[in-house]
Amino acid sequence: KSSNEATNITPKHNMKAFLDELKAENIKKFLYNFTQIPHLAGTEQNFQLAKQIQSQWKEFGLDSVELAHYDVLLSYPNKTHPNYISIINEDGNEIFNTSLFEPPPPGYENVSDIVPPFSAFSPQGMPEGDLVYVNYARTEDFFKLERDMKINCSGKIVIARYGKVFRGNKVKNAQLAGAKGVILYSDPADYFAPGVKSYPDGWNLPGGGVQRGNILNLNGAGDPLTPGYPANEYAYRRGIAEAVGLPSIPVHPIGYYDAQKLLEKMGGSAPPDSSWRGSLKVPYNVGPGFTGNFSTQKVKMHIHSTNEVTRIYNVIGTLRGAVEPDRYVILGGHRDSWVFGGIDPQSGAAVVHEIVRSFGTLKKEGWRPRRTILFASWDAEEFGLLGSTEWAEENSRLLQERGVAYINADSSIEGNYTLRVDCTPLMYSLVHNLTKELKSPDEGFEGKSLYESWTKKSPSPEFSGMPRISKLGSGNDFEVFFQRLGIASGRARYTKNWETNKFSGYPLYHSVYETYELVEKFYDPMFKYHLTVAQVRGGMVFELANSIVLPFDCRDYAVVLRKYADKIYSISMKHPQEMKTYSVSFDSLFSAVKNFTEIASKFSERLQDFDKSNPIVLRMMNDQLMFLERAFIDPLGLPDRPFYRHVIYAPSSHNKYAGESFPGIYDALFDIESKVDPSKAWGEVKRQIYVAAFTVQAAAETLSEVA
């Protein structure tokens, strides 16, 4: 058979035909359609959108499109008993209350079912007490407060600014510090870019704008009541007291107008340094409590949200592969939004929709991919990646045997400066080669490749002439596929200039002002960045599903493994005396990485030389590539995080959004100088080095000649 057995068009023409079919105007139209009303997880509106997408994907030509439903724990404000925060005087009278809703944007004044700002999964409670300002509520912020400033947060309500780390980590840190409540706010220093107007006149956050979001610490568990298993109709559910990852103290988010009112009265200690000061006209005093004149006033939280088991719906579309139907390439992104979802997620969902339409067009012309492509519209991502995780739990046996790759498709844009890619090292070469073939949409790069503009604007800090590609962390739907199942994964979107815009995320993230108009007026009027992201995501899926030999380069894993080994070793070497005392050696890890490198090199040579017309040998080599990511999975998982099983990468224990390399060793070394039993602590470091070395060696052996 020819190498082109899956199609009636030449392979080069296929990719071109697929890319040429993608149209910016369609993405624009789909975005508009998806953003006219809220699509909150668990609501009727989001169920209707699921059915609409199911119907349209069928029309586009997919072989089958099914809804997969689960009954999971969600969280909603009480409609008749709103959440708010007060300043109370010594008599208990409320002398200031935070706003109950965001002022709706122009044109949306009459839209119903806009959920007011809340912290999803906050327990109910009405704590009152003195305020302590804890900066970003990062691990290092609490170290500064407790160890250096000797400020005790126990029994206090803490106020933390959004940004830098995942909000769930902030809440966990506050709980561990003994706080009895958390107020989260958006500081203009992080959510108001200088020289840009507030929405609706620009893309900055107005003072009444508030970031919603969940505050769970699930560590990959999915539905809090059914960890490890799908929340189906015969599921056994834990009691709420045993649920995974729920916060134990009330939490509520506010905008910077309201934050000003709380922070301007703060007394106690001055901020330790300028990094603790935001951009409000307040002293940023740490507290505890208010200054002199206001010292008898307290802060009181009123939180009445409820946790409810609610039905959610994923849409799963299938385009059957012609040659290897039992090999799955998955493109997935979520559909649920906090409000209108102008960027998150619908800028991604619109791109997925157009990718499905393009693949469907090719299929109607008689083409099929070599491998099966699965398309997914996930539900309840905003509530803890629930839809994707439950589906993966339900289908884990199929996925671990058949899953080739997962490409994530949440927000297509978080800026309009350059490309941003996070992926497994196996995909580095795929991404490089693809972006060299795509045109850059950037001003000043007309006629140049996307690779060129990306490399110029976002150069790799380590490798000359290469663009930056980051580690996968979490906070999105690839988590279960990569961190739990070990399926090669990647994500791509257009981003801001991190050099000049140091605010966190994009200013209107998870606010009511994330509308279609935000995108159409300010971010991407021509939808050229959306189109580029569609080309990157779609192009990756196309290559992964259609190339004869999987487009994975195991040599790139070898390079990063050595880099990560050097990094973790240098962290450990900050304690040379203890390393001597406890006989801590990284030699086993260094040796395993070198073995991996040599075996990967030999495998790559065989990959270039083998007879690709022999289907058995081809399948054998492709299986070795497909299962390499799987080989980095430790079935026992990481300490206290059983669903994070990848030994090379995990979400940082201090920031779910960030990826950490050799996380087991990293966590064992973290703050080791403060451990009460150094012998035990260094013993755990040694154990983690052993686990890492064994895993790398075992992974290397999967690439060895089979006999």
Epitope: Y428, S429, V559, R562, D566, S570, T597, S601
Partner: antibody, heavy 122, light 111 residues
Framework: EVQLVESGGGLVKPGGSLRLSCAAS????????MNWVRQAPGKGLEWVSS????????YYADSVKGRFTISRDSAKNSLYLQMNSLRAEDTAVYYC???????????????WGQGTTVTVSS | QSVLTQPPSVSGAPGQRVTISCTGS?????????VHWYQQVPGTVPKLLIY???NRPSGVPDRFSGSKSGTSASLAITGLQAEDETVYYC???????????FGGGTKLTVL
């Protein structure tokens, strides 16, 4: 016979440019990391730059970063070093050297060219 | 000032055994990076003598041997001969510099 032959050296003024070439034969050039190493008169060996087999991983010594560019053409079995903004301290014999594998940080350099002399002087 | 430290010179009588040391740090030899040794006769091209700490390329006499322990490595030459009188370099990789590093070279004199 495994062989590396450098060319392109010469006398150049400070601030000037030169392009060195290295022709490889007798081995599968496309499978190995390649390097440039230099030796100033009466001094020791100094690594300058490395490039891996598919030109994706490129590294430079701090002393030449931003001024020198390494490249290769596997179809022509050739390695290049474009040297810009040359300084007097770049005066040296420049050797092209093959790494024993595709990872410059692990392996020794088993094949060396005869060297080409670069003199930077006004 | 080289990252890898070698003695500027060593000497020995014909037939004797000499060792040349190469001292690194926790970022190169101590970080699991191998050491390689080269011989360079003045006016000629460097020649690989020992690779991966202790391996000899074909054609190198077994009088030459290498070893590495921790942050130090050494090249031993037994049965010293007149033609061994030349310069020897050690080489490794330094992760803090992200680059290949050479020792300053050691001149061996056969007395």
């Amino acid at each position: 016979e495994v062989q590396l032959v450098e060319s392109g050296g010469g006398l150049v003024k400070p601030g000037g440019s030169l392009r060195l070439s290295c022709a490889a034969s007798g081995f599968t050039f496309s499978r190995y990391n390649m390097n440039w190493v230099r030796q100033a008169p009466g001094k020791g060996l100094e690594w300058v730059s490395s490039i891996n087999s598919n030109s994706r991983y490129i590294y430079y010594a701090d002393s030449v970063k931003g001024r020198f560019t390494i490249s290769r053409d596997s179809a022509k079995n050739s390695l290049y070093l474009q040297m810009n903004s040359l300084r007097a301290e770049d005066t040296a014999v420049y050797y092209c050297a093959k790494t024993m594998g595709d990872y410059y940080y692990y392996y020794g350099m088993d094949v060396w060219g005869q060297g080409t002399t670069v003199t930077v002087s006004s | 000032q080289s990252v890898l430290t070698q003695p500027p010179s060593v000497s020995g009588a014909p037939g004797q055994r000499v060792t040349i040391s190469c001292t690194g740090s926790s970022f190169n030899l101590g970080a699991g990076y191998d050491v390689h040794w080269y011989q360079q006769v003045p006016g000629t091209v460097p020649k690989l003598l020992i690779y991966d700490n202790s391996n000899r390329p074909s054609g190198v006499p077994d009088r030459f041997s290498g070893s590495k322990s921790g942050t130090s490595a050494s090249l031993a030459i037994t049965g010293l001969q007149a033609e061994d009188e030349t310069v020897y370099y050690c080489q490794s990789y330094d992760s803090s510099l992200s680059g290949v590093v050479f020792g300053g070279g050691t001149k061996l004199t056969v007395l």
